[in-house]
Structure formats: C-alpha cells, structure tokens
C-alpha cells in the first residue's frame, strides 16, 4: 500500500493586504478515511484555520467541494488578508477515530502579506535654530511588507544626502517600520523652504508616498536693527526711527529707552510679509529736545522670539547747537540687556 502524501506545492505565497490568498493542498490517496484540517503554525500553540468537517470559519472557503466523492483537493481560500495572517500554514491529514488521530502534515506554505507603508510623517526640531545651524528632521512610516523600501529626502526639490535610515525589525516580520533622520543646514532664505520625505515600495506601483515639513517651523531669522534720526522739526522735536528688518517669526517686541528709562513698548502684529517670508517693522520716537538739558541717549531694544534682547543706541545732542542736528546719523550698537516691557503695536 502506497504511503499517503500530503502535498503543499507552494513553499511560499505572497498576497497584498485586502486580497484573498489561495493555499493549495492535495492528498495522494483517499485512504485512510479521515478529515483534513488547516493550521497556522505547528506545535502546541498552532491555530486551527479550517476544519473541513465542522466549525465556523467565515473568512475561509474550500476551493473545491470537499463533500464531492473522491475529492483529493483540500485547498482553501482566505479572504481579506491582513498582515496578522502572515505565517506558515500546514495542511494536516487525520485518521478517523475518537478522537481523530493526526497522521501526516504537508511541508507548509509560508504566507507573506504585501502591505502598503503608512503616509510618511515628518517631524522637525523641537526648538528653532538660526541660519548656518544644522537641524534634524525625522520621517517615519509603518506597517509595510515586504521589508525592501526606498526612502529619499528633498529640500525644495533638491535631493539631500546627509541622512540615516533604519528599517525595523532586522529579521523577518509580519510588517516593518522605517525611520530616517535627515540633517539640514539652514540659510536665512529658508522661511519658505520645505523638506520632503519620499517613500517608494513595491505595493505603491511606482507612485511614492510623500511627507512634508516646512522649515518655517524650524528656523529663526534674527532681525537687523538700524536707528536713525530724521531732521529736527520746527517745534524742537526730533524724530528717531528704529528699523527692524528681515526677521522671522513675527513674534517681536520693541522697547524704547530714554536715558535707560522705558519710554514705550510695542509688539509686532499683522505685519506684511516680505517675498522671502521675513518681516520688517519700523518704529519711531519723537523726542522733545527743549525738555532736556543734556544729550539724550535713546535705545531701541528688540526681543525677538523669546531670545535675549538686542540693543541699538543713539545719542541726540542737546547742549551744543541743537538746531543743527544732522539727519540719518549712524547709531551705536550695544549688547546691553535692559528690562523688557511688553507693549502694543507700533
């Protein structure tokens, strides 16, 4: 008598998530009498996937009619495959008895599931950095299979080369995750720049997924300060202007100090944007020269985005020839930190 063979012809089968998987199994003989069962895995923890004799298995259907006389095909179809279905499936022949006795197992068919990567999520640094500094952006995508995947970084359409990518886990798994960290050197012109993480995978049919991050979230462009005096007015008032230019983000407060005492505090809001995404702001102060005996030291103190204050000072000459004050006189720049007072818009 020929020994019964349980034949699982495919060593492995690969299926896209959501599709159906067909697992083939035939037996070489109709005897001995007894049922066929399908298991995922072997050993004591194996899961019963389908019992052709009894049970309710809503996602599993036999390929051919198991009740048909002389049927030797015990292939099954599993619908709506998910990554959790991955594993090795065994077609097992039992000899009829009380209970049925396991007789022979097929060699097993490994089911792998092709699953699309999730949309890449790009996250930037927790704190802003200034131009010439390097910041890191991280891109993550999860749940894909098989493991082979390609990830590229771009800044404004130009491919980046300074990045490190890891795919986990290292060995075989149901699904995988990718994490990549790119290092980007900031420039003052990067307010409108964008970094893009692009992920290509066999399941995407050549249409890669992209995740983006705006460098505006990562960059701080500190302002330039210039203090100038406009011409003396007939009423002995001097108009001193503080020009704050090319800064980002908009969060900025400006304080005028007269001889070290706070004169006025203003806060930037609703400023028009420059082409490069930065902002400009001009604040002015009228100083009544006749009210002062000595020269007046005016300081324009700017605190930008929570950073230490930057000062520009300017001396208005009162004692000698006040009416001959020149216009647009260069101011002196100091790094002195004065106390900051939050004020309104200027």
């Amino acid at each position: 008598e020929e020994e019964l063979q349980v034949i699982q012809p495919e060593k492995s089968v690969s299926v896209a998530a959501g599709d159906s998987a067909t697992l083939n199994c035939t037996v070489s003989s109709l005897i001995p009498v007894g049922p066929i069962q399908w298991f995922r895995g072997a050993g004591p923890g194996r899961e019963l996937i389908y019992n052709l004799k009894e049970g309710h298995f809503p996602r599993v259907t036999p390929v051919s009619d198991p009740t048909k006389r002389n049927n030797m095909d015990f292939s099954i179809r599993i619908s709506n495959i998910t990554p959790a279905d991955a594993g090795t499936y065994y077609c097992v022949k039992f000899r009829k008895g009380s209970p049925d006795v396991e007789l022979k197992s097929g060699a097993g068919t490994e089911l792998s599931v092709r699953a699309k990567p999730s949309a890449p999520v790009v996250s930037g640094p927790a704190v802003r950095a200034t131009a010439e500094h390097t910041v890191s952006f991280t891109c993550e995508s999860h749940g894909f299979s098989p493991r082979d995947i390609t990830l590229k970084w771009f800044k404004n359409g130009n491919e980046l080369s300074d990045f490190q990518t890891n795919v986990d886990p290292a060995g075989k798994s149901v699904s995988y995750s990718i994490r990549s960290t790119a290092r980007v050197v900031l420039t003052r012109r990067d307010v409108h720049s964008q970094v893009i993480c692009e992920v290509a995978h066999v399941t995407l049919q050549g249409d890669p997924l992209r995740g983006t991050a705006n460098l505006s979230e990562a960059i701080r462009v500190p302002p330039f300060l210039e203090v100038t005096q406009q011409s003396m007015r007939a009423d002995n008032q001097v108009n001193v202007t503080c020009q704050v230019t090319k800064f980002y983000p908009q969060r900025l407060q400006l304080t005028w100090l007269e001889n070290g005492n706070v004169s006025r505090t203003e806060m930037a809001s609703a400023l028009p944007e420059n082409k490069d995404g930065t902002y400009n702001w001009t604040s002015w102060l009228l100083v009544n020269v006749s009210a002062h005996r000595d020269d007046v030291k005016l300081t324009c103190q700017v605190e930008h985005d929570g950073q230490p204050a930057v000062n520009k000072s300017f001396s208005v000459k009162v004692s000698a020839h006040p009416k001959e004050q020149g216009s647009n006189t260069a101011a002196e720049n100091t790094g002195t930190n004065e106390r900051n007072i939050y004020g309104g818009s200027g």
């Epitope: 895995g41 072997a42 004591p44 396991e102 197992s105 060995g171 075989k172």
Partner: antibody, heavy 122, light 112 residues
Framework: QVQLQESGPGLVRPSETLSLTCTVS????????WSWIRQPPGKGLEWMGF???????FYNPSLKSRVTISLDMSMNQFSLKMTSVTAADTAVYYC????????????????WGQGTTVTVSS | DIVMTQSPLSLPVTPGEPASISCKSS???????????LDWYLQRPGQSPQLLIY???NRASGVPDRFSGSGSGTDFTLKISRVEAEDVGVFYC?????????FGGGTKVEIK
Amino acid sequence: QVQLQESGPGLVRPSETLSLTCTVSGGSIRNYYWSWIRQPPGKGLEWMGFIYDNGRTFYNPSLKSRVTISLDMSMNQFSLKMTSVTAADTAVYYCARVRAYSGIGLDGTDVWGQGTTVTVSS
Amino acid sequence: DIVMTQSPLSLPVTPGEPASISCKSSQSLLYSNGYAYLDWYLQRPGQSPQLLIYQGSNRASGVPDRFSGSGSGTDFTLKISRVEAEDVGVFYCMQALQTPLTFGGGTKVEIK
C-alpha cells in the same frame, strides 16, 4: 544569524518580582516559540514556559501561578515576570527559540541566549 | 508530566573512542505522525546549551556527524562515534512532545 540577549537585574529581593527581557536580533519572532529555561547553581535545566508568535502561552505547572511571559513583536522582545521570588529561584535564566515544523510537538530549541544570573537575596 | 531519566550520571571517556548515553521517558514520545519528539543538548562548561539532535535522530545544523541519535517510543540513545576533547560537558535529553517540556538530569562527560 539570530541572536538572543537577556537583560534585567542581577539581584532581586525575596518576595519581590523578577523581571527579565529577551531581545531577538537578526531574525523574526514569527513562526517560533519563545522560551524561558533556568538552571539553578550546579543543577540541571528547568523549562519555565514559552509563548508562541500568536500570543498563546504555556507554563510549567510547578511555576504557573507565579510566571507570566509576554511578547512585544514591535520591539522584537519577549519578557518573563515571576512574582514572590525566594532563594530557590536563584539561577541562570536563559531565553531560547524553539522551532515547530511538524504536528503538535516541537523540533528543537535551536537558539539560546548566553544566560543571565539572577540572585535572590536580601 | 513526562519524566525523563538519563544514564549514566557520569561518563569518563577516552578521546577517539565511542561513547553512548541512554535516555528513557515515562511515556511514549512517538506522535501519531510518526515523529518521536526527543531532543539532545550539550552544555559545555560555562556555556549555554546547544541543540545536537531533534526528533530523536535528526542532527541540528552545524553538528558534526560523529553525533547520532536513535530510538523510538520510550528508549533513546545518543552515540558519539569518536569522542573529541571539545565534547566534554553535560549532555541533556528533553522531551518536546507535550508541555511542560522536561529534561533528563544530565550526563557529565569528562576525559579520563
């Protein structure tokens, strides 16, 4: 190739809980059983239990009430927790991979960690 | 639980000579599919155990062919055709048919 690395405290106080983690590198957790085995000083091997990739656990009845084995597939790790330890639990603890290719039985514990010594003492 | 009994407890050997270790189980390890679920392990001094034989007679990957396993049912034997110095250590049999998995007490092989 696949490597296993046990980690956890080397000293545990009596009546406290022993916690060990085994990290699987270079291979998948899928299709294998993941076992904890211990060896008291100068003695033989004792199987404590294992977990399959589907989360099904099997424990040694002599320890069952005190032992929990869990699996973290995302981290490629599995863990052992044993409550109410005594000096008799002092041993080298091994994590190991068990193959299963056929039937209801198992086909060899083919990969072992290097073992971690746990001493139970106050 | 299935009880595993090994003999001898200690085995002094001469390099180049054969050696044999016996393992008996309290119930049959032969499953209805024809496989006998018995493993043999070697634990060298200061090392983790290493799988030598599974299913009673199948050599594990990388194991020298001087090791062979035989037997079925309840009586199993591990044979070393020519002992080498690196074979010293404790040999364990383990039943893998049902949980709890159980080990024999071990056989210590040492060079005479």
